[in-house]
Interface confidence: medium
Amino acid sequence: EEELQMIQPEKLLLVTVGKTATLHCTVTSLLPVGPVLWFRGVGPGRELIYNQKEGHFPRVTTVSDLTKRNNMDFSIRISSITPADVGTYYCVKFRKGSPENVEFKSGPGTEMALGAKPSAPVVLGPAARTTPEHTVSFTCESHGFSPRDITLKWFKNGNELSDFQTNVDPTGQSVAYSIRSTARVVLDPWDVRSQVICEVAHVTLQGDPLRGTANLSEAIRVPPTLEVTQQPMRVGNQVNVTCQVRKFYPQSLQLTWSENGNVCQRETASTLTENKDGTYNWTSWFLVNISDQRDDVVLTCQVKHDGQLAVSKRLALEVTVHQKDQSSDATP
């Protein structure tokens, strides 16, 4: 004769408030004859959850028809779950006896816990921009999950980060928990197009983690490099001077030309191009009139980038006597 086994396959059952929970229990033998009852807890203080023969259990229904002769499935459904329903549930086999049935065997128990999904992680970066090679901090927060066990990982683009600190609150028992993590990220010059990703894994997510992202473009400032050059070719009686502002981010930039210390108001031609790394190049052309009276012309290209202190580059204009002679003869 096969020994009776009480099978409760789930050690832990995560349920949501208001939903229906299914507690599984199957037996491996029809013998001994006698009923199967459901209890929450163990010992003398255990609470009867379901008895097919007697009592009124309005929230409990059976999965199978227990009146069928060969039924071996004693699973139940409990509807409208509340926080008061948490605990460990046991299905227990009783042997028919006189004057009363005798407990024969208990299942291993299924712990019912309230499972709540974590909220979508929110990643916040620094309040102010920082230049490459410096470290910036990002925080990631997710709330409202249960049980407390949770895994959080940080990535920069495809690479996992290791420099972070994580806290789960509260430390004691609670209906729901929150996680907060702070990661330290060293900025690279090409990080305008980079992302930091906070990934949260929890039992309620069934292996599909939640992700929050932040763009490093919000955190980085790449300061420009300046170069001022005089073009060898002349246009009539004018010399073309170029100011190249390279590899800057963000796009916010003010460029002014000054001639011997005097700011020039006139229009200058310029182009803006984007580099593959997301930084920008700005080229400005300035035409200077050549005349006999102009011996020493110092041109300054001044750039104010993203509200920072202005940087400038100067160029002493080289005008040969030959060029002057030509320009004085040239017709406008």
Epitope: N157, G158, D188, D191, Q195, T273, E274, K276, D277, G278
Partner: antibody
Framework: QVQLVQSGAEVKKPGASVKVSCKAS????????IHWVRQAPGQGLEWMGW????????NYAQKFQGRVTMTRDTSINTAYMELNRLRSDDTAVFYC???????????????????WGQGTMVTVSS | DIQMTQSPSTLSASVGDRVTITCRAS??????LAWYQQKPGKAPKLLIY???SLETGVPSRFSGSGSGTEFTLTISSLQPDDFATYYC????????FGQGTKLEIK
């Protein structure tokens, strides 16, 4: 799945312009640069330039500077390439292609192209 | 500009053969090289990136090697589906393609 679908074949007269579209699906359009490559009949592949769909920023090969314009419409996940002042030697298949990596993993940020459109044949003939 | 030179321009081979295509860069490009396969009327298909990394879904009979200026694409045992034109592409500084190698049935 990830794919790029291009507009149909075009026949144009010399001096005219052509605008080819490239509709992206199956991925975040703004996360990856779109490149344009052309191939004349029986010839090799020639890179024309790229557009950053996120910012609209562009970078063109020197050969096409001043004649090509790349734009995008993020609301419909579509990139466009317009070539002006067409000549008979512009007759070619034009491909759009997406880079494999959507972020910068090294200083130059350049990357290989793993998703290609089916190509658009542009014939320039008087 | 970086120039890419492929050799040979045409290669005749039989099913089961081991074939090698060479690509030379006019200056060092580290490992920033990709190999593409193109069939008539179709778009190029990425086979190898970063000189030796096999793209997902590409059969393992394809392999790439080299760094600096000399690179090779090897097909260990040629299959009927492999007859096509192969292009190398550098992406160290902008993008340049080789002129292509047409692999045809002997």
């Amino acid at each position: 799945q990830v794919q790029l679908v291009q507009s149909g074949a075009e026949v144009k007269k010399p001096g005219a312009s052509v605008k080819v579209s490239c509709k992206a699906s199956g991925y975040t359009f703004t996360g990856y640069h779109i490149h344009w490559v052309r191939q004349a009949p029986g010839q090799g592949l020639e890179w024309m330039g790229w557009i950053n769909p996120n910012s609209g920023g562009t970078n063109y090969a020197q050969k096409f500077q001043g004649r090509v314009t790349m734009t995008r419409d993020t609301s419909i996940n579509t990139a466009y390439m317009e070539l002006n002042r067409l000549r008979s030697d512009d007759t070619a298949v034009f491909y759009c292609a997406r880079e494999r990596v959507g972020y910068c993993s090294r200083p130059s940020c350049l990357d290989d192209l793993n998703i290609w459109g089916q190509g658009t044949m542009v014939t320039v003939s008087s | 500009d970086i120039q890419m030179t492929q050799s040979p321009s045409t290669l005749s081979a039989s099913v089961g053969d081991r074939v090698t295509i060479t690509c030379r860069a006019s200056q060092s490009i580290s490992s920033w090289l990709a190999w593409y396969q193109q069939k008539p009327g179709k778009a190029p298909k990425l086979l190898i990136y970063k000189a030796s990394s096999l793209e997902t879904g590409v059969p393992s009979r394809f392999s790439g090697s080299g760094s600096g200026t000399e690179f090779t694409l090897t097909i260990s045992s040629l299959q009927p589906d492999d007859f096509a034109t192969y292009y190398c592409q550098q992406y160290d500084s902008y993008y340049t393609f080789g002129q292509g190698t047409k692999l045809e049935i002997k």
